[in-house]
């Protein structure tokens, strides 16, 4: 008789999760010389230890501390790109602008990007059937707590001018409930961060509106200014041209507004 298993509302652990994490770790440490000292088996053991045999609605940031310690990484604090609801373009950008970094360009972010995982209380099994949904089940689930932890640390490390890419096609360009709005914004350190520069990415080719006037952008501006950080906002009317101009800044068409 099969043992009764908790049914959660979200998708289960990504198939071949342990193998994927281990393979990603090996690949990352090969590509990034500064992380060659990392022992990927230890990283996987620490990752596993954060959620295996624990109730998937009772995960804490402390559970991830051994993994955080092993994945400690120094990125240039003045070259950080945050993003909200526009991950693909942010990643395309940092693939071209190699001296800037999203969270997913760091080891820990790279390991977990697009993956789901959870375990079960009192068993060493990984749950491949279902995992808790943030809204429908619980917020203290393994995936949400992981991203909250690494996002907080990433924001805390930032300095000087921090950039954030925002999706101008969304009804809420700045969403207080996003990871950026709920975690990163509040963990930027005013003693280190002078300015937050928002890049609002336009969706439609004929969209010439100034999305920096959007009420949610003004809400972000207010939150940031109250934290004694300057706020800057720029419209990116043509994201395709924007990327092209990052690749080829000398192009004559790149002097005009993008």
């Amino acid at each position: 008789v099969p043992r009764w298993r908790q049914q959660w509302s979200g998708p289960g652990t990504t198939k071949r999760f342990p193998e994927t994490v281990l393979a990603r770790c090996v690949k990352y440490t090969e590509i990034h010389p500064e992380m060659r000292h990392v022992d990927c088996q230890s990283v996987w053991d620490a990752f596993k230890g954060a959620f295996i045999s624990k109730h998937p609605c009772n995960i804490t940031e402390e559970d991830y501390q051994p993994l955080m310690k092993l994945g400690t990484q120094t990125v240039p604090c003045n070259k950080i790109l945050l993003w909200s609801r526009i991950k693909d373009l942010a990643h395309q950008f940092t693939q071209v602008q190699r001296d800037m970094f999203t969270l997913e360009d760091t080891l820990l972010g790279y390991l977990a990007d697009d993956l789901t995982w959870c375990g079960e209380f009192n068993t060493s099994k990984i749950n491949y059937q279902s995992c808790p949904d943030w809204r429908k089940d619980c917020s203290n689930n393994p995936v949400s707590v992981f991203w909250k932890t690494v996002s907080r640390r990433f924001a805390e490390a930032a300095c000087d001018v921090v950039h954030v890419m925002l999706n101008g096609s969304r009804s809420k360009i700045f969403d207080k409930n996003s990871t950026f709005g709920s975690v990163e914004v509040h963990n930027l350190q005013p003693e280190k961060v002078q300015t937050l520069e928002a890049w609002v990415i336009h969706g439609g080719r004929e969209d010439s509106r100034d999305l920096c006037q959007d009420p949610t952008i003004k809400e972000l501006e207010s939150i940031i200014s109250k934290r004694n950080i300057q706020f800057s906002c720029k419209n990116i009317y043509r994201p395709d041209k924007f990327l092209q101009c990052v690749k080829n800044p000398e192009d004559s068409s790149c002097t005009s507004e993008i």
Epitope: K192, E197, C212, E221, S225, N228, S232
Partner: antibody, heavy 119, light 107 residues
Framework: QVQLQESGPGLVKPSETLSLTCTVS????????IHWLRQPPGKGLEWIGV???????DYNPSLKSRVTISKDTSKSQVSLKLSSVTAADTAVYYC?????????????WGQGTLVTVSS | EIVMTQSPPTLSLSPGERVTLSCRAS??????LVWYQQKPGQAPRLLIS???SLETSIPARFSGSGSGTDYTLTISSLQPEDFAVYYC?????????FGQGTKVEIK
């Protein structure tokens, strides 16, 4: 190109209200904050206050009880009113644009206008 | 409020000389410091922000340094057009405050 120009009476009587206008061009008041500063003859600079792009204001506590900054976005104008003036308010008054959307320092300044407080 | 103190009040120098101007804050301003240049009858002109970031079109002979409460503006080789008054300003907290200025005059 970005320009700011202060205008208003060059002479104000003691106890009266000093009123100045800053007219801007080359950018929108919905995109940047405008600061007012002053410089008594032969002395240093003093920050008076700012009106942010959304219309909220911050003032220097030393002047807060006497100062009001407002704006008319459609006319691209920002006004400064300083009440109950004395000879100590004699200065060159500048308006200046914040460097970024919500900027705490200034990349473009008006040429300044000298206001003398005297009877 | 944060008090900004500049020294010396006046410097008498010749073209080509290296200039070092000092600005001290009454408390830590966390690198929120700008430098302006002002010539007689003109408005101040922004030179450097965030301690070290040179504004566009400002010559590379100007540079800034410092941290905490102590900051420095250096002009590596004084040009005739550099004779002016230099002000530092903190933007860590309101009210934003300025030093009293250092006048760089021709010897």
């Amino acid at each position: 190109q970005v320009q700011l120009q202060e205008s208003g009476p060059g002479l104000v009587k003691p106890s009266e209200t000093l009123s100045l206008t800053c007219t801007v061009s080359g950018f929108s008041l919905t995109s940047y904050g405008i600061h007012w500063l002053r410089q008594p003859p032969g002395k240093g600079l003093e920050w008076i206050g700012v009106i942010w792009r959304g219309g909220s204001t911050d003032y220097n506590p030393s002047l807060k009880s006497r100062v009001t900054i407002s704006k008319d976005t459609s006319k691209s104008q920002v006004s400064l009113k300083l009440s109950s003036v004395t000879a100590a308010d004699t200065a060159v008054y500048y308006c200046a644009k914040g460097k970024v959307t919500t900027g705490f320092y200034f990349d473009f300044w008006g040429q300044g206008t000298l206001v003398t407080v005297s009877s | 409020e944060i008090v900004m103190t500049q020294s010396p009040p006046t410097l008498s120098l010749s073209p080509g000389e290296r200039v070092t101007l000092s600005c001290r804050a009454s408390e830590d301003i966390y690198n929120r410091l700008v430098w302006y240049q002002q010539k007689p009858g003109q408005a101040p002109r922004l030179l450097i922000s965030g301690v070290t970031s040179l504004e566009t079109s400002i010559p590379a002979r100007f540079s800034g340094s410092g941290s905490g409460t102590d900051y420095t503006l250096t002009i590596s080789s004084l040009q005739p057009e550099d004779f002016a008054v230099y002000y530092c300003q903190q933007y860590w907290s309101t009210p934003y405050t300025f030093g009293q200025g250092t006048k760089v005059e021709i010897k």
